[in-house]
Interface confidence: medium
């Protein structure tokens, strides 16, 4: 067993680990999110730039100066352009958030196109369906029951968007919907240690060849890619979806990363390469948003003056549109965009952010220098919930992202989508659905605590991701029923 | 339709332990979650505890939270409610019922099983 004085030898300051855990016993126990014990952890040290801290049995280096920061995810992205996790490549293993910095490229490249703001605008009209069938369910449930458990039901018209917008499917009925997403749940939430493993062997995963993913999840994604590139019959159809690009590269048999653009750094685009993408694309399109919704419809329902203001945006701006919500609408409307910023504030989804040191490299400002292979985190909560960036962390507060505000923070201060190069590819397609469906429901409901709503709310200690503990209850009262 | 039945309720002295189980048969697929209700004596009918079939996301009320634990087995298409250090304040007709996907309309209920808590 390797000893923890790594950090020690190396005048690093951090917590003292605990054997076999090292500073990580609460979320390998699955007692606390690993989101929240890396805020615990950067919270120990408030005067320094770096802590040295222990997953399991690796060292790895906690970064909370927000210069430093800049630097690893912009100035010197070149070193830190792996994320470092490392599990098989078979079996969903190559995706494009979890792919070593060379496959990323190759396949980054590629997809960034899917997001343009063209591409965009197209698959709004699929969104807007999604959202409208969504808000006729919760009308029809709303007079059985106005108490809704909300991040759960979100789930289906992001699931529905989803798979609209990238695969051309239509969950036309709900128990499909609910079939394929009780299945994708299974990758969220099912306990695998697997990740524990690879922080304390790094690279064993790899080696044998083990990965993370369940088998009932890798065969959900072959089954749809499958049934897709037959549909199709292996050519892009023309609808210029996401699976248009994926046969597109199916028929271009690899792709290049345009770093040294010699076969060398090529990749074999096989049907498993294929899945891992269909993969990734599904689970970020459909967890996180609907998460953060959850989240800002939480918020909304507690504090009512902020959801007023919100309403009447809302009301203000489709009296302008003949009632329709489209694709500039839903940027013109100021404050709710700014409602979702504050809620991915308090709420960043992916925690901690992970890098993987390329080479030896000195931590500016510092006299540490990590090696080659040293797994940096950041903890965009820590940073979130910092009072230096954030006066009153703990409360919502939308006007925190008027433009002179963001003007006076550093750009670090704020990390729900990662930053630099390898930021989150989708943060656009997220706003947009995001926004499309939480104007419906707010141009037609009003949101309240129900009496099961949780107002000490917990992070899921289970999930991969940040989600609500038990779910948001809320009431959704139709506004037609309230003066 | 999917079928509920209750089982494992009883008298029991305060301050012991109790397990109820609910087995659910049918079209158990149409079921995101399952809840445990109670209703004491001239009381309204009130939810203690919940849990989702797929990803195992669990909600406890407040006034049950520390002493009642809620799992599943999914091989069984079982819910358990296991209730320690039961007061007096217990005794009530303890119902399973199950729910769909963010719905908190429970559309399928069991019979109920009493629980009797002496003092």
């Known amino acids: 067993m390797r000893t923890f004085n790594y950090w020690k030898k190396r005048n690093v300051r951090g917590p003292e680990p605990v054997v076999f855990f090292g500073n990580l016993k609460d979320s390998a126990l699955r007692k606390k999110n690993m989101g929240v014990v890396m805020e615990e952890l950067y919270n120990m040290f408030p005067e320094e730039k770096v802590i040295g801290i222990y997953r399991m049995t690796s060292p790895c280096l906690l970064v909370r100066d927000l210069d430093v920061i800049k630097h690893i995810m912009i100035k010197d992205f070149e070193v830190f352009s792996d994320r470092g996790v490392e599990f098989s490549k078979e079996g969903l293993g190559s995706n494009l958030f979890h792919a070593d910095g060379e496959t990323w490229r190759a396949l980054g490249n590629r997809f960034t196109p899917i997001f343009t703001s063209g591409k965009l605008k197209n698959m709004f009209y699929l969104m807007h369906e999604g959202a409208d069938n969504f808000i006729d369910h919760v009308s029809a449930e709303c007079e059985k029951n106005q108490e809704f458990e909300v991040h759960s039901l979100l789930q289906t018209y992001t699931m529905s968007t989803i798979a609209a917008c990238a695969f051309g499917i239509s969950y036309d009925s709900i128990g499909d919907k609910v079939k394929a997403l009780d299945i994708v749940d299974k990758i969220i939430s099912e306990p695998s240690y697997a990740i524990e493993l690879d922080m304390m062997y790094p690279g064993l995963l790899s080696k044998l060849n083990l990965s993370i993913f369940p088998t009932v999840v890798k065969n959900f994604f072959k089954s749809l890619v499958d049934n897709i590139v037959a549909q199709r019959n292996g050519k892009p159809s023309g609808r210029n979806d996401f699976m248009d690009l994926i046969l597109e590269l199916r028929q271009l048999g690899e792709v290049t990363s345009n770093k040294y653009g010699s076969s060398a750094s090529s990749l074999e685009i096989t049907d498993e390469v294929i899945c891992a993408q269909a993969f990734v694309f599904y689970i970020a399109g459909y967890e996180t948003s609907a998460t953060t919704m959850a989240y800002m419809i939480y918020q909304l329902a507690l504090n009512p003056d902020i959801q007023n203001k919100l309403i009447a945006e809302v009301d203000e701006v489709l009296k302008a549109n003949d009632g329709k919500v489209t694709y500039d609408t839903v940027k013109e409307m100021k404050y709710l965009n700014k409602a979702f910023d504050e809620t991915l504030r308090m709420y960043s989804i992916v925690e901690p952010l992970q890098r993987k040191a390329t080479r030896d490299y000195k931590i500016p400002g510092t006299d540490v220098v990590i090696e080659k292979d040293t797994i940096v985190l950041i903890s965009p909560r820590g940073i979130h919930y910092d009072p230096k960036y954030y006066d009153n962390p703990k409360q919502f507060n939308p006007d925190r992202f008027d433009a002179e505000e963001v003007g006076k923070r550093h750009p670090c201060a704020y990390l729900p989508f990662g930053l630099g190069q390898r930021n989150c590819i989708g943060m656009r397609f997220g706003r947009l659905q995001s926004l499309l469906c939480i104007t419906k429901i707010l141009s037609k409901f009003r949101i309240e605590p129900s009496k099961n709503t949780d107002r000490n709310l917990q992070v899921e200690p289970h999930r991969g991701l940040i989600g609500p503990k038990g779910g948001i209850r809320v009431n959704a009262i139709p506004r037609k029923l309230v003066s | 339709q999917v079928q509920l039945q209750e089982s494992g309720g009883g008298l029991v002295q305060a301050g012991g332990s109790l397990t109820l189980s609910c087995a659910a048969s049918?079209?158990?697929?149409?079921?995101?979650?399952m809840g445990w209700f109670r209703q004491a004596p001239g009381k309204e009918r009130e939810l203690v505890a919940d849990?989702?079939?797929?990803?195992?996301?669990?909600y406890y009320s407040d006034s049950v939270k520390g002493r009642f634990t809620i799992s599943r087995d999914n091989a069984k298409n079982t819910v358990y409610l296991e209730i320690d250090s039961l007061k007096p304040g217990d005794t009530a007709v303890y119902y399973c019922?199950?729910?769909?996907?963010?719905?908190?309309?429970?559309?399928?209920w069991g019979q109920g099983t009493q629980v009797t808590v002496s003092s």
């Open positions: 849990i989702a079939w797929s990803d195992g996301r669990i």
């Open positions: 049918g079209r158990t697929s149409r079921s995101y979650a």
């Open positions: 019922a199950s729910r769909a996907r963010g719905t908190v309309s429970y559309n399928y």
